[in-house]
């Protein structure tokens, strides 16, 4: 009697199941009591000897490629051996690599967590994922895992993390890069500094006083509000960041406390107050202001 090993499917894709069947064309296995055993190269598979002529392999991997055969043993201990069958497990190359961010859109607050999620639409086996920073890539991390996605985490984002990023996936058929993703780090405004600038050391009535407010840190655009004794004088915008100025033509009523507020939508900060006092110098005809 002859024995045949049949693999179904005969050319499996990585990760898919395969059924091995030990066939006896001229003998019904019910005619006699047989025990079956399946082998790869020199190693017995599954449970070893069993009464079932089938062996189900849940998932085949590239490293499972090899020479398979089966043996059948009768009660009289006569052993039949099949010819070897070569089973080649097919690996699917990675395709359609994409990089996504958490939070979505690539905008993240300074100090918050950023996750760069690298995904492949197709690909089997061990996939190596690599993350790069900058258009000319600086390798940040690599991970090898048997999954279609992998994550790289920046637990607390800093201003210096604002850059372009991309990832690369590879499973033995050459690296495949994702598209670029840009990360914008949003920075709340720092407490602004208010400076009063006058055309001369002692400003006089009708002089133009410049109120200059500047937050040294903060993502643009920044909106500055100017106050005199908590009454709004007006606002100025700094679309590209930096400071902003508000001009005031002085009258005697302009004595008192001045402050400014910076707001970039991520929070507002108020400056310390700056006091402006009128002094009347001896023998002087006009009132003067000092701060």
């Amino acid at each position: 009697a002859e024995l045949f090993l049949i693999a179904s499917p005969s050319h499996p894709t990585e990760g898919s199941p395969v059924t091995l069947t030990c066939k006896m064309p001229f003998l019904q296995s019910s005619d006699a009591q047989f025990q079956f055993c399946f082998f790869r190269d020199t190693r017995a598979l599954g449970p070893g000897w069993s009464s079932s002529p089938k062996l189900q392999i849940a998932a085949m991997w590239k490293e499972d490629t090899g020479s398979y055969w089966c043996e059948a043993q009768t009660m009289a201990s006569k052993v039949l051996r099949s010819r070897r069958s070569q089973i080649n497990v097919h690996r699917v190359p990675v395709a359609d690599v994409s990089l996504e961010t958490q939070p979505p859109g690539g905008q993240v607050m300074e100090g918050d967590r950023l996750v760069l999620i690298c995904s492949v639409a197709m690909g089997t086996g061990d996939i190596t994922f690599l993350w790069y920073k900058g258009a000319v890539g600086l390798n940040l991390q690599s991970k090898t895992q048997r999954s279609l996605t992998a994550e790289y985490e920046i637990p607390s984002v800093r201003e210096s993390d604002a850059e372009q990023y991309y990832c690369v996936a590879e499973n033995g058929y050459g690296p495949s890069p994702s598209g670029l993703v840009s990360i914008t780090v949003r920075i709340p405004v720092s407490r602004p500094i208010l400076m009063l600038r006058a055309p001369r050391a002692q400003a006089a009535v009708e002089d133009v006083l410049e109120l200059h407010c500047e937050a040294l840190r903060g993502s643009p655009p920044i909106l500055y509000w100017f106050y005199h004794e908590d009454i709004t004088l007006g606002s100025r915008s700094a679309p590209s960041g930096g400071g902003a100025s508000f001009n005031l033509s002085l009258t005697e009523e302009h004595s008192g406390n001045y402050s400014c507020e910076a707001n970039n939508g991520l929070g507002a900060q108020r400056s310390e107050a700056v006091t402006l006092n009128f002094t009347v110098p001896t023998g002087a005809r006009s009132n003067h202001l000092t701060s």
Epitope: G106, A135, V136, Y166, P177, G179
Partner: antibody
Framework: QVQLVQSGAEVKKPGASVKVSCKAS????????IHWVRQAPGQGLEWMGW????????KYNEKFKGKTTLTADKSTSTAYMELSSLRSEDTAVYFC????????????WGQGTLVTVSS | DIVMTQSPLSLPVTLGEPASISCRSS???????????LEWYLQKPGQSPQLLIY???NRFSGVPDRFSGSGSGTDFTLKISRVEAEDVGVYYC?????????FGQGTKVEIK
Amino acid sequence: QVQLVQSGAEVKKPGASVKVSCKASGYTFTSYNIHWVRQAPGQGLEWMGWIYPGDGNPKYNEKFKGKTTLTADKSTSTAYMELSSLRSEDTAVYFCARRIHYYDYFDYWGQGTLVTVSS
Amino acid sequence: DIVMTQSPLSLPVTLGEPASISCRSSQSIVHSNGNTYLEWYLQKPGQSPQLLIYKVSNRFSGVPDRFSGSGSGTDFTLKISRVEAEDVGVYYCFQGSHVPWTFGQGTKVEIK
């Protein structure tokens, strides 16, 4: 297939501005940087800078800062290069090119746009 | 800025014979990530530049194997093993390691 198609030749007077377009097709526009390269008549190639169409963020060769403005319109997959305060020295062919990251090379180039500055 | 100096500036060649172009950078173009971003481009008459070699020695897809690149640090070479008629044009080396990125001044290859 990937294509970068640039706008036609321009003749401008000194002091004027010019805006050259580069329309991309056949790939995801926001996935790659677009670079600009200048070639003066009978001269070599000069790298001007790049723009990332994803967020419109440009990076300039210091030499071209203030002279050049790079922008991109995601809705039309078009990159733009604007030259201001034109002088006769700005007469050149301007190329846009796509640069592939990781492998790092310019794989596709526009056909070039000749800008002539003449009074 | 890094200056890329090519030699010779003009190279008359015989069809079927080898040709070699040298490119020297004014300082090392090894990037901080360990890669050397040295590329070679060919600009045929009336055309846009086209990529031949990237990262010193990697041939771009579709580029004939008669083209090869070599070198390290500051000295790089492009070799054509057997020149063909379609190889005429201006060859440029380019460094993309340090901003501003710079091209060599070009080498004009023509048939004798």
